[in-house]
Amino acid sequence: EPAVYFKEQFLDGDGWTSRWIESKHKSDFGKFVLSSGKFYGDEEKDKGLQTSQDARFYALSASFEPFSNKGQTLVVQFTVKHEQNIDCGGGYVKLFPNSLDQTDMHGDSEYNIMFGPDICGPGTKKVHVIFNYKGKNVLINKDIRCKDDEFTHLYTLIVRPDNTYEVKIDNSQVESGSLEDDWDFLPPKKIKDPDASKPEDWDERAKIDDPTDSKPEDWDKPEHIPDPDAKKPEDWDEEMDGEWEPPVIQNPEYKGEWKPRQIDNPDYKGTWIHPEIDNPEYSPDPSIYAYDNFGVLGLDLWQVKSGTIFDNFLITNDEAYAEEFGNETWGVTKAAEKQMKDKQDEEQRTRRMMRTKMRMRRMRRTRRKMRRKMSPARPRTSCREACLQGWTEA
């Protein structure tokens, strides 16, 4: 039987307001509203918490019966829909210990795990997976790309007691591995030997000057010489113009700076590699994955452009159950959501075309009127006569 620690689908109207607590840490936090957005697969089932004010921090959280994930799998899952074509804003959740004062939750409140998508400018379109390990927030060393379209997407983090993890988007694995390999939780296993240093006589030069090579005697010629073809102008007056000097030209015999030829260095030892030793600071930790206490799920975000909808939150110890829950929620409504969006886009395109047509028609009418105003008064004649007289209808 799977343990379901937290589940929230917002299916009871305003009931969510009694379960979710707004932080009072700042007076100007943005407001969440319950909405299924401008398009959806199912208007009721797709209702979730939507950010509603631009350029705001948001801080909202819900508590649950505290639990520890020691010795068991932890699965965190939720859906995010950036229907506003997000430019910069978070779509991630934080899992806190139950010691969190929910009314004072803010960006620096200590959390256990942070997980989910984050978009900001062209440089950031990533899924954060951050663990608080011994009081420090440790970021994943891999770059996991998040979805940046306007549709609802399902994000899943799985942390297992064998210190492995998996990240899924839309129920498909996008990353997996070992916690020790993909985060800097522990000091490196090996370090450079602090007592070792490059020997004084270590020669890293692959090539050296050939000691037997010498500069040819006729090498040193000046770079510039007086132009031998130049002649003193006939009207040159030495008293007035000073002593005449022929113009200087590039010396065709100039060879530049002489450099001895290069030969292989017989003493070359290669690049010195600093020897490594076992790091005395390193010791494995089989319980990196484990937390004593989870008790609060929080949305602690900044959004430049609001409109993101969060829904279908689930915290459980059962991977199969989470996958099934994802398929029964996001999986069921995703196609209809896309259909509704496509239909809206099509209607918008049609409206735009109609508006363009109307505008063109108005412009033609205006041009016609202008032309009539500017042309000389026409005598009342039949069309045939008018044409013969050279009048042309617009």
């Epitope: 350029a55 430019d87 910069c88 804003g89 978070g90 960006g107 620096d108 984050d118 978009i119 900001c120 400018g121 062209p122 440089g123 950031t124 990533k126 954060h128 011994k134 009081g135 420090k136 927030n137 970021l139 800097d184 975000l301 900044w302 959004q303 430049v304």
Partner: antibody
């Protein structure tokens, strides 16, 4: 990679204000956070505040709160730092520095350090 | 407010290992960055996130951070490494720098 070019040296009277500019090129301005750091003669580095242009909001060190204003103009990829009520202790080299923006939270860029610095602007406050 | 403490100066013989410390209350829970500054020049980031090297920074620069001390280690120190070094962290919603350490390469 982004490059930062700062405005020229300034000599100011006590009580007046100074506005130093920092123009970014060679990168997307909205992908960075800009910090302002000053260094008095023979002293260490001191953070004054920073701005994330895409946010539009600035964050200030408590010491300078109310006296410093940091702004950014995305259209010209330029950040500005204005310090008012100048006193002789404000004589320093003022640097702008950028951090890559790796997330939407205020603190994200501080995880990555300030990887590009302007050449510095000397501000002398003297009567 | 959060404070970072560095020794004012450290000396090292060429080719030997230099260690510069940065002390702060539970600094091991923070992300620490290190900057090198040579006279008349702007600072240069040499280590970020405790131990990561930006591209272009030689391998001899490394960093560690745990407990109440972060350390910048320069192995096989060269004359060109002579400079001021500053540690930096994010504490209490503000950026904090250490007071700086002057590294002298002897000889």
């Amino acid at each position: 990679e982004v490059q930062l070019v700062q405005s020229g040296a300034e000599v100011k009277k006590p009580g007046s204000s100074v506005k130093v500019s920092c123009k970014a090129s060679g990168g997307t301005f909205s992908s960075y956070a800009i910090s302002w750091v000053r260094q008095a003669p023979g002293q260490g580095l001191e953070w004054m505040g920073g701005i994330i242009p895409i946010f539009g909001t600035a964050n200030y060190a408590q010491k300078f709160q109310g006296r410093v204003t940091i702004t950014a103009d995305e259209s010209t990829s330029t950040a500005y730092m204005e310090l008012s009520s100048l006193r002789s202790e404000d004589t320093a080299v003022y640097y702008c520095a950028s951090s890559p923006l790796r997330g939407s939270g205020w603190y994200w860029h501080y995880y990555y350090g300030m990887d590009v610095w302007g050449q510095g602007t000397t501000v002398t406050v003297s009567s | 407010s959060y404070e970072l403490t560095q020794p004012p100066s450290v000396s090292v013989a060429p080719g030997k290992t230099a260690r510069i410390t940065c002390g702060g209350n539970k600094i091991g829970t923070k992300s620490v960055h290190w900057y090198q500054q040579k006279p008349g020049q702007a600072p240069v980031l040499v280590i970020y996130q405790d131990s990561k090297r930006p591209s272009g920074i030689p391998e001899r620069f490394s960093g560690s951070n745990s407990g109440n001390t972060a350390t910048l280690t320069i192995s096989g120190t060269q004359a060109m490494d002579e400079a001021d070094y500053y540690c930096q962290a994010w504490g209490s919603s503000t950026v904090v720098f250490g007071g700086g350490t002057k590294l002298t390469v002897l000889g």
